[in-house]
């Protein structure tokens, strides 16, 4: 898990002739806001998919009124970052769409009107945890300057935010087969192990020790099929005893949709389906005519010559909603399971499965250790569908086939000298230090600071670490 962050630096006329007219005027003051849409992958197919990685809307910028006769300057921007949280791995390659919207604040009947000023798009490679990347994009006569980065949310680390870090359980080392978490050397990589007994078929986990149920299953181990026949509400949390979903708070509770809009839950939050004459995230924008361009995605607006007469959007194929705001394809049916990414190719569907899952719908949970041998006494460990070998001392690599130099990582602290040994490594500590890795200073009075030296060994003696 992590967050994609976008910082808009400026939006204004681009270089060259044909400077755009200011979008605001004394008669029609306005303010800007931005929308970002993220999609995984660099391919054209991914660009056709919905905002599968997420989307975000900025706050509104300061109100701006054009000075008569002045050219359009860089327009005042909203404060703060646009943040798009992502729940799964950061894909490394992504496509983005950044839209600049104008909110007119004149004497609109029923509130402000929105219109799209500019849309820029691109495809980029980006590792999570890296520095801010700067970019300039042009849309017509407008120029947008921005920076972006992806960062992992603890406990996730790594360029894809897939490695989990946990504080060390013992001060001296990480558990068998687990590496220290760079750059958090005081933390250890944690294996993704679901709660014991969690159904491999109907449950999954994103944090170690948890057991989250796929739709249609409930109970602490996701072994109880949901029976909705005797239920009032089709929403969790679940009751393990009856297998019946008990009503719980959800994003549509209290109906956030104004003006008679109907609310439906989405995987990320909620979506409002607005009655004709209203649009916006919560159906809060009204008094709209065809002149306001309320039909999205190439929809044709008819009627609505004045704010009192309703307009109708005739949507192009593949779009629905009173403002043609909903893309409708077979991916809308959410056919890909276990977090797979759906692509509608027109003639067929494609599910891109997360690691550890396979099948046309990502319905098969791969038992990665089946038929896998770890060499040289290593043992196979399954975690989150990924096969990994926990190697015996002295061996490393994916299948424990490589001879490991245990001293390569300079494991002996405080100037201790490392010696490779058939059973691992031995640290010969510098005077004043002790421990398997020479990590503990010896107090001047001869007592060690945690733990005490085993009987028969003087501090500073080489100790075998098994």
């Amino acid at each position: 898990a992590g967050v994609f962050e976008l910082q808009i630096h400026s939006f204004g006329p681009g270089p060259g002739p044909g400077a755009p007219r200011s979008p605001c005027s004394a008669r029609l003051p306005c303010r800007l806001f931005f929308r970002v849409c993220l999609k995984p992958g660099l391919s054209e197919e991914a660009a056709e998919s919905p905002c599968a990685l997420g989307a975000a809307l900025s706050a509104r910028g300061p109100v701006y009124t054009e000075q008569p006769g002045a050219p359009a300057p860089d327009l005042p921007l909203p404060d703060g970052l646009l943040q798009v949280p992502f729940r799964d791995a950061w894909p490394g390659t992504f496509s983005f769409i950044i839209e600049t919207w104008r909110e007119e604040l004149g004497d609109q009947i029923g509130g402000p009107a929105w219109s799209l000023l500019a849309r820029v798009a691109g495809r980029r490679r980006l590792a999570a945890g890296g520095p801010w990347a700067r970019d300039i994009q042009r849309a017509g006569a407008w120029e947008l300057r921005f920076s972006y980065r992806a960062r992992c949310e603890p406990p996730a680390v790594g360029t894809a935010c897939t490695r989990l870090c946990r504080p060390r359980s013992a001060p001296s080392r990480c558990g068998p087969g687990l590496r220290p978490c760079a750059p958090l050397e005081d933390e250890c990589e944690a294996p993704l192990v679901c709660r014991a007994g969690c159904s491999p078929e109907h449950g999954f986990c994103e944090q170690p020790g948890e057991c989250r149920c796929l739709e249609g299953w409930t109970g602490p181990l996701c072994t109880v099929p949901v029976s909705t026949s005797s239920c009032l509400s089709p929403r969790g949390p679940s009751s393990a005893t009856t297998g019946c979903l008990v009503p719980g708070p959800g994003p549509c509770d209290g109906n956030p949709c104004a003006n008679g809009g109907s609310c439906s839950e989405t995987p990320r939050s909620f979506e409002c389906t607005c009655p004709r004459g209203f649009y916006g995230l919560r159906c809060e924008v009204s008094g709209v005519t065809c002149a306001d361009g309320p039909c999205f995605n190439g929809g044709l607006c008819v009627g609505g010559a004045d704010p009192d007469s309703a307009y109708i959007c005739h949507c192009p194929p593949g779009f629905q909603g009173s403002n043609c705001e909903k893309r409708v394809d077979r991916c809308s049916l959410q056919p890909c399971r276990n977090g797979g990414l759906c692509l509608d190719l027109g003639h067929a569907l494609r599910c891109r499965c997360r690691a550890g899952f396979a099948g046309p719908r990502c319905e098969h949970d791969l038992d990665d250790c089946a038929g896998r041998a770890c060499a040289n006494g290593g043992t196979c460990v399954e975690g989150g569908g990924a096969h990994r070998c926990s190697c015996a001392l002295g061996f490393g690599g994916r299948d424990c086939r490589e001879r490991a130099d245990p001293c390569a990582a300079r494991p002996c602290a405080h100037g201790g000298r490392c010696y490779a040994h058939f059973s691992g490594l031995v640290c010969a500590c510098a005077p004043g230090y002790m421990g398997a890795r020479c990590e503990f200073p010896v107090h001047p009075d001869g007592a060690s600071a945690l733990p005490a030296a085993p009987p028969g060994l003087r501090p500073g003696d080489p100790q075998r670490y098994l």
Partner: antibody, heavy 122, light 107 residues
Amino acid sequence: QVQLVQSGAEVKKPGASVKVSCKASGYTFTDYFMNWVRQAPGQGLEWMGVINPYNDITIYNQKFQGRVTMTVDRSTSTVYMELSSLRSEDTAVYYCAREGVLYDGYYEGAYWGQGTLVTVSS
Amino acid sequence: DIQLTQSPSFLSASVGDRVTITCKASQNVGIAVAWYQQKPGKAPKLLIYAASNRYTGVPSRFSGSGSGTEFTLTISSLQPEDFATYYCQQYSTYPYTFGQGTKLEIK
């Protein structure tokens, strides 16, 4: 083998509702979208909508939006299509049809039920 | 909605003839086109999917071709059991739509 068995013929009055069932067997019920298509006497085929039996998500033809409801009973592997506010022009044979071309590189055929004749007459 | 126009609407032919039915889409549908055969009182049967792929069990005399907006169904040598109504269908974009049908009759 794959079978889709639909409920019997119905005669309804204008303004009433009809609920047609389609019981599936011979395959994993939740793995395939189920479409509903109708055919008025002597006319062509008209797509009404689709439901994913795995998660109950539906997409309806906007022509029928607000009048059609598709539901699933996973315990009996049955899909239902209910059409309300019936009018005489809704007289047709209603078919359930398991979607065919589903996943890239993986094809299993489209299968149709035998059809249910719904007659709307006062 | 995407319109599909089939031609001809009626076709008279004899056993052994080669016949071609065309289907034109009002906008690009890629190769997301299927062809069905329907006999009176029966449900449609799938012949071709993805414009040119013959469905399992369909005789090799049936073939499909085309992409974008123009598609054809060809029956290389008509058999007595082939006299029926044929429909093209696009499944590129919701709502799915069908052609108006081509009725193939014995001459």
